[in-house]
Interface confidence: low
């Protein structure tokens, strides 16, 4: 039988589970999708990023004892950025200097822009499958933040008796993930 209860999980609260040794997929594989400018005259400790830095994340989702059948691919929006409209001024050196001098009170952060809800199947130890709804980030945007901003864009909302997924120790899986899991 299948347990078709649908629960809502958000991908930021779950931790990747290692793939079976024979699998060649790398978890938490990320590649840098943004272009960078050197910011030496403005902030010698960091590099200013033009547009958003979009990391591509590949991970398995687990609720602790059930694990996704296939890895989930999504974007992770990370770091500081410059909104694209100001780039010409930045390159010209005018607006940019002014902008960076005001960093103490406000900054531009790369945040989630577009998301979609997708169903994923988790396979469980006893052979049953459990269906979850996951919000997956599909695009990032550059957003201005003041110090008062609190970045809590996700709320956990469960529609079943399951507790929210939590971080947990990685653990070995005894068999390759596939359509059924094994008892």
């Amino acid at each position: 039988f299948k347990n078709d209860a649908t629960e809502i999980l958000y991908s930021h609260v779950v931790k990747p589970v290692p793939a079976h040794p024979s699998s060649n997929s790398t978890l938490n594989q990320a590649r840098n999708g943004g272009r960078h400018f050197s910011s030496t005259g403005l902030d010698r400790n960091s590099r200013v990023q033009v547009g958003c830095r979009e990391l591509r994340s590949t991970k398995y989702i687990s609720d602790g004892q059930c694990t996704s059948i296939s890895p989930l691919k999504e974007l992770v929006c990370a770091g500081e950025c410059l909104p694209l409209p100001v780039l010409p001024n930045w390159i010209g050196g005018g607006y940019g200097t002014k902008y960076w001098s005001r960093r103490s009170s406000q900054e531009w952060r790369c945040v989630n822009d577009k998301t979609r809800t997708q169903r994923i199947q988790l396979q469980c130890q006893d052979g049953s499958t459990r269906t979850y709804k996951i919000t997956v980030v599909t695009a990032c945007k550059c957003k201005r933040y003041t110090r008062q901003h609190n970045e809590s864009s996700h709320n956990f909302e469960s529609v079943s008796p399951a507790k929210p997924a939590q971080h947990h120790r990685e653990r070995k899986r005894a068999s390759k993930s596939s359509k059924h899991s094994l008892s």
């Epitope: 609720d63 130890q125 947990h168 120790r169 070995k172 005894a174 068999s175 059924h180 094994l182 008892s183």
Partner: antibody
Framework: QIHLVQSGPELKKPGETVKISCKAS????????MSWVKQAPGKGLKWMGW????????TYADDFKGRFAFSLETSASTAYLQINNLKNEDTATYFC??????????????WGQGTLVTVSA | DVVMTQTPLSLPVSLGDQASISCRSS???????????LHWYLQKPGQSPKLLIY???NRFSGVPDRFSGSGSGTDFTLKISRVEAEDLGVYFC?????????FGAGTKVELK
């Protein structure tokens, strides 16, 4: 050493409720799901379902939906099986069991000693 | 549900004999990942079942090498090369390829 220790035998009347406990030791309780298996006198084994000890979500086999409830007391590393509105056919030994590995494709390696529930008027 | 059929239901043996138990499933137990999740258990009177063989032919830790398992698809066999007194009891086959997990009715190995 891994141990699953179950509560003692129960004698109940039809219509009553019984709650069996299974205390786990020797491993991290929330890492492995706990299944329950029924064995009626002189009969074979029947898998009843399991509970995810990490999330608390139970899954029941078709024949055990309704009157049967799996629950946990995680702080005490204990799983429970409750049977409501007992019937004569619930007379059986009930085992709590755990797999050898996280996904237990390697069979059920660890069994409690069993709890005999007798239902009789 | 997958039905597991064991034969014989009773197997009288003499100590030192070879014993063979057959288990047939109502559908193939080969999983899409290539593994076959067929297991054997021994239950002695008044005790819990104990895992003997997992995934057709793998002996669980501490199980003597006189026990061996074989088979594929829907037909499986457990062999005891030389039966000892401690081997007497009821043997169950079980599958965990399909949900729900199911068991055979058992084969009672007893002295002639």
């Amino acid at each position: 050493q891994i141990h699953l220790v179950q509560s003692g035998p129960e004698l109940k009347k039809p219509g009553e409720t019984v709650k069996i406990s299974c205390k786990a030791s020797g491993f991290s309780f929330t890492t492995y799901g706990m299944s329950w298996v029924k064995q009626a006198p002189g009969k074979g084994l029947k898998w009843m379902g399991w509970i995810n000890t990490y999330s608390g979500v139970p899954t029941y086999a078709d024949d055990f939906k309704g009157r049967f409830a799996f629950s946990l007391e995680t702080s005490a590393s204990t799983a429970y099986l409750q049977i409501n509105n007992l019937k004569n056919e619930d007379t059986a030994t009930y085992f709590c069991v755990r797999g050898r590995e996280y996904y237990y494709g390697s069979g059920i390696a660890f069994w409690g000693q069993g709890t005999l529930v007798t239902v009789s008027a | 549900d997958v039905v597991m059929t064991q034969t014989p239901l009773s197997l009288p043996v003499s100590l030192g004999d070879q014993a063979s138990i057959s288990c047939r499933s109502s559908q193939s137990l080969e999983h899409s990942n290539g593994n076959t999740y067929l297991h054997w258990y021994l239950q002695k009177p008044g005790q819990s079942p104990k895992l003997l063989i997992y995934k057709v032919s793998n002996r669980f830790s501490g199980v003597p090498d006189r026990f061996s398992g074989s088979g594929s698809g829907t037909d499986f066999t457990l062999k005891i090369s030389r039966v000892e007194a401690e081997d007497l009891g009821v043997y169950f086959c079980s599958q965990s390829t399909h949900v729900p997990l199911t068991f055979g009715a058992g084969t009672k190995v007893e002295l002639k």
